[in-house]
């Protein structure tokens, strides 16, 4: 798309071209309306690396609540239903953003903050190491 | 959780209770220092459910780039190396914040956005629909 | 300080491969993008592709899709980029160069260069 | 892909006069960045996104354009701003660099 100027009803701020701090508006507009509502919610048991989710919450964070995946088995379920331990449940982590109140306890003063987050497992080729 | 009281030292707001503009620093404290450095790197190839990364760009966004996953085959990878198509690689998909310019082009200004990632893709039984 | 160092320089035979090293240091490594980008003598830029070590996601420049490979290891923040069947055409300055992915942290743009890998093809 | 054109190739070019390299896109791009290239040197990111100088960078460089036509401009032209310099898209795939614009000193 073609690159518009600055435009020019934008809130004021110190520096323009590398700001620290921000405004933002926490009413949160929803791109995934159109997306199946279903999403991923019944592969954490049907899946070859099954996982449960875990809440975790924090009310100094937002959002204040996150579900974290934990692989159930080493190893991954086969055909016949077992586990296999030829082969590993891993997690699948993701690095996300949110939002840390600061200082502690307002409402209205974040800090950007990155976290490790594991949304799911998979099944992988374990690495073998040969010892000579 | 535990209600804490407002800490005197926050930034004043119209509302403090509920706020809709609030300020963000975006210096990123990033959480994750004592982490597994290696993280998912390389279970996109080693998973029997292997996917591909796609790299979306988009300058009105924070964060800009975002890597997205996508299964490489219906079926998943056997103990062959050959895939079965009596399984399914289903993408783990999760729902993150991001931060969006608004009004758009404003280097200060934003608005909470939720969008729809995938992240990695898990092997799962498929759903099978007997007919009567 | 933030420094992108690269391995040195390579003489190679028409198609054989080469493949060169670069290690980060001074940042956190999985908060960049390592693109390549390479110069033939007397020329011009030309990009070639790009890794991310988080995730290990790669974009390469179709001009190059099939004969290059880039990989990352995050437990030496180093990235490495293979270049087969190498043709007297591909002898270049080979440079690694980081790219943010968070806003408070750069601006989105090659901001840190290495010093540059001679790659000669002759046979 | 999308073709930079710089103009000129070469400029020689007077201490404290004004030069301007302008950068014409084959399609329209969001944002151009500025690389300046000294000889046996790596490139230095100089203006990232259009018009917003890279750190020590003096203020006499400015950059400015939107769409297919983009400007990088010296005000008062000093020795040290002898090298190449190079526009660069990130648009779309491949990224791609204009053929660089060689300024000299007289």
């Known amino acids: 798309g073609i690159t518009i100027p600055r435009n020019p009803g934008c809130p004021n701020s110190e520096d323009k071209n590398f700001p620290r701090t921000v405004m933002v508006n926490l009413n949160i507009h929803n791109r995934n309306t159109n997306t199946n509502p279903k999403r991923s919610s019944d592969y954490y048991n049907r899946s070859t690396s099954p996982w449960n989710l875990h809440r975790n919450e924090d009310p100094e964070r937002y959002p204040s609540v996150i579900w974290e995946a934990k692989c159930r088995h080493l190893g991954c379920i086969n055909a016949d239903g077992n586990v296999d331990y030829h082969m590993n449940s891993v997690p699948i982590q993701q690095e996300i953003l949110v939002l840390r109140r600061e200082p502690p306890h307002c409402p209205n003063s974040f800090r950007l903050e990155k976290i490790l987050v594991s949304v799911g497992c998979t099944c992988v080729t374990p690495i073998v190491h040969h010892v000579a | 959780g535990i209600t804490i009281p407002r800490n005197p030292g926050c930034p004043n707001s119209e509302d403090k209770n509920f706020p809709r503009t609030v300020m963000v620093n975006l210096n990123i404290h990033n959480r994750n220092t004592n982490t597994n450095p290696k993280r998912s790197s390389d279970y996109y190839n080693r998973s029997t459910s292997p996917w591909n990364l796609h790299r979306n760009e988009d300058p009105e966004r924070y964060p800009s780039v975002i890597w997205e996953a996508k299964c490489r085959h219906l079926g998943c990878i056997n103990a062959d190396g050959n895939v079965d198509y009596h399984m399914n690689s289903v993408p783990i998909q999760q729902e993150i914040l991001v931060l969006r310019r608004e009004p758009p082009h404003c280097p200060n200004s934003f608005r909470l956005e939720k969008i729809l990632v995938s992240v990695g893709c898990t092997c799962v039984t498929p759903i099978v629909h007997h007919v009567a | 300080e933030v420094q992108l160092v690269q391995s040195g320089a390579e003489v190679k035979k028409p198609g054989a491969s080469v493949k060169v090293s670069c290690k980060a240091s001074?940042?956190?490594?999985?908060?960049?993008?390592v693109h390549w980008v390479r110069q033939a003598p007397g020329q011009g830029l030309e990009w070639m592709g790009v890794?991310?070590?988080?995730?290990?996601?790669?974009a390469y420049n179709q001009k190059f899709e099939g004969r290059v490979t880039m990989t990352a290891d995050t437990s030496t923040s180093t990235a490495y980029m293979e270049l087969r069947s190498l043709r007297s055409d591909d002898t270049a300055v080979y440079y690694c160069?980081?790219?943010?992915?968070?806003?408070?942290?750069?601006?989105?743009?090659?901001?840190?260069w290495g010093q540059g890998t001679l790659v000669t093809v002759s046979s | 892909e999308i073709v930079l054109t710089q103009s000129p190739d070469f400029q020689s070019v007077t201490p404290k006069e004004k030069v301007t390299i302008t950068c014409s896109a084959s399609?329209?791009?969001?944002?151009m960045h500025w690389f300046q290239q000294k000889p046996d040197q790596s490139p230095k990111l100089w203006i990232y996104?259009?018009?917003n100088l890279a750190s020590g960078v003096p203020s006499r460089f400015s950059g400015s354009g939107s769409g297919t036509d983009y400007t990088l401009t010296i005000n008062s032209l000093e020795a040290e701003d002898a090298a190449t310099y190079y526009c660069?898209?990130?648009?779309?795939?491949?990224?791609?660099f204009g053929q660089g614009t060689k300024l000299e000193i007289k």
């Open positions: 160069t980081r790219y943010s992915l968070f806003y408070g942290s750069s601006p989105y743009a090659m901001d840190y």
């Open positions: 001074g940042y956190t490594f999985t908060d960049y993008e």
């Open positions: 890794i991310d070590p988080g995730t290990g996601g790669v």
């Open positions: 399609s329209s791009v969001n944002y």
């Open positions: 996104r259009t018009s």
């Open positions: 660069q898209q990130r648009s779309s795939y491949p990224w791609t």
